[in-house]
């Protein structure tokens, strides 16, 4: 707390320069009005003013705006945006994407703060949703952000947003998070031909189920290995050893090396030995010839 | 104890550069702002140039604006004054100084470099 005192003689600021980099606290806190202040908000941000100084403007801010600010000032606050704490930040209604553009900006090449965070969480729920637009800029900023969302959020993610996530943005995502994205990507990709289709809807993969897994196969679409390991070990147990070779294409030959880890070990298992020698690759640990599958599943549903 | 350690003065002809450098030591710098300051014989001390704690903002006087550069590589604890179209009237010592507070209450010191202009 800055100790209320009189502004020196001749010192009164009337506007926002370079002038006040030479004030101490107290003077900052005397010789500038908080609307002057709030109206030259865009200069702040060319001025080196010090950590100390920015604390003395925010206190300035708050004691005029002590319900939050207004958008107006929110969007040029520029660095002293640093200064905001997440608390602040629930006080604000920004609803510009300039003004969010603006924010990340002050805080691009840093991991997502909590203030960031905040900012991002208001932004959204006052929008609605996380339109194209939104996810456009904030992958732009963060592209783990889409990975970050709960399944639950990521449900209010529209179909017609998924055209700005680019494979990237999906790096972090785990399977529960793609199984809420593969649908959304599918019904925007719809309309596409079949190896732009697969292109698209590559990156999404990880939420797709058996039946669009065997239906990808009987299109000649060459998935690398890398795709193929990071599919639902469910939704590929049940792919029969011709569906796989044809929807691994030439890179059916990996499978070899990745015969350990799951889901090609799993899917091993569950494949008879004589299908697996067709592939040629020596994969061992399918079911010996003349050994009965009895599927348990299906018992029970019958019983 | 913190410490900053000027460098790289010396002698230079009217229309030389100079680059000088001042190396912090302790737990300094990232979060304060800097300053290069200059002393010339029987004259107080002038602020030439002084930089913000990210790096992004910059101010001049005057005197030296378009002329002197000042910059900081946080991650090396460094701060650098580069300067162009020397004159005589440039001549004098170059202090580093740091503060938290304000551009004119600084928190720390160097000894300071000799940078004379002279044919």
């Known amino acids: 707390e800055v100790e209320k005192t009189a502004c020196p003689s001749g010192k009164k600021a009337r506007e926002i320069d370079e002038s006040l980099i030479f004030y101490k606290k107290w003077e900052l806190e005397a010789c500038v009005d908080a609307a002057l202040l709030a109206t030259q908000m865009d200069r702040v941000n060319a001025i080196p003013f010090t950590y100390e100084q920015l604390d003395v403007l925010k206190h300035k801010l708050d004691e005029l705006y002590p319900q939050g600010y207004p958008e107006s000032v929110i969007q040029h606050l520029g660095y002293l945006f640093l200064k905001m704490s997440p608390e602040d930040i629930r006080k604000w209604n920004v609803t510009s994407l300039e003004t969010l553009k603006a924010l990340l900006e002050v805080n691009k090449g840093h991991e997502m703060s909590p203030q960031v965070a905040t900012l991002i969480d208001r932004f959204v729920k006052g929008r609605g949703q996380l339109d194209k637009d939104t996810l456009d800029t904030l992958t732009a900023f963060y592209p783990g952000y889409l990975c970050s969302l709960s399944p639950e959020e990521l449900s209010s993610v529209p179909p017609s947003s998924i055209w700005a996530v680019r494979p990237q943005d999906l790096d972090t995502c785990d399977p529960r998070q793609l199984d809420v994205l593969y649908p959304k990507a599918r019904l925007a990709f719809q309309n596409m031909n079949g190896s732009e289709y697969f292109v698209k809807i590559q990156s999404f993969l990880g939420g797709a189920p058996t039946e669009d897994l065997k239906a990808l196969s009987q299109q000649n679409v060459s998935m690398d290995l890398a795709t193929f390991m990071k599919l639902r070990t469910d939704a590929v147990l049940p792919l029969t050893v011709a569906e796989v070779q044809k929807l691994l294409g030439p890179h059916v030959e990996g499978l070899k090396a990745e015969e350990r880890h799951r889901p090609v070990r799993d899917w091993i298992l569950r494949q008879r030995q004589d299908d697996l020698d067709t592939l040629g690759l020596g994969l061992q640990g399918g079911i010996p010839n003349g050994y009965l599958v009895l599927d348990l599943s299906m018992q029970e549903a019958l019983s | 104890e913190v410490q900053l350690v000027e460098s790289g003065g010396g002698l230079v002809q009217p229309g030389g550069s100079l680059r000088l450098s001042c190396a912090a030591s302790?737990?300094?710098?990232?979060?304060?702002?800097m300053g290069w300051f200059r002393q010339a014989p029987g004259k107080g001390r002038e602020l030439v140039a002084y930089?913000?704690?990210?790096?992004?903002?910059?101010y001049y006087p005057d005197s030296v604006e378009g002329r002197f550069t000042i910059s900081r590589d946080n991650a090396k604890r460094m701060v650098y004054l580069q300067m162009n179209s020397l004159r005589a009237e440039d001549t004098a010592v170059y202090y580093c100084?740091?503060?938290?507070?304000?551009?004119?209450?600084?928190?720390?010191w160097g000894q300071g470099t000799q940078v004379t202009v002279s044919s």
């Open positions: 930089i913000s704690w990210g790096g992004s903002r910059t």
């Open positions: 100084a740091a503060t938290i507070n304000s551009a004119s209450d600084y928190d720390y």
């Open positions: 302790g737990r300094i710098l990232s979060n304060y702002n």
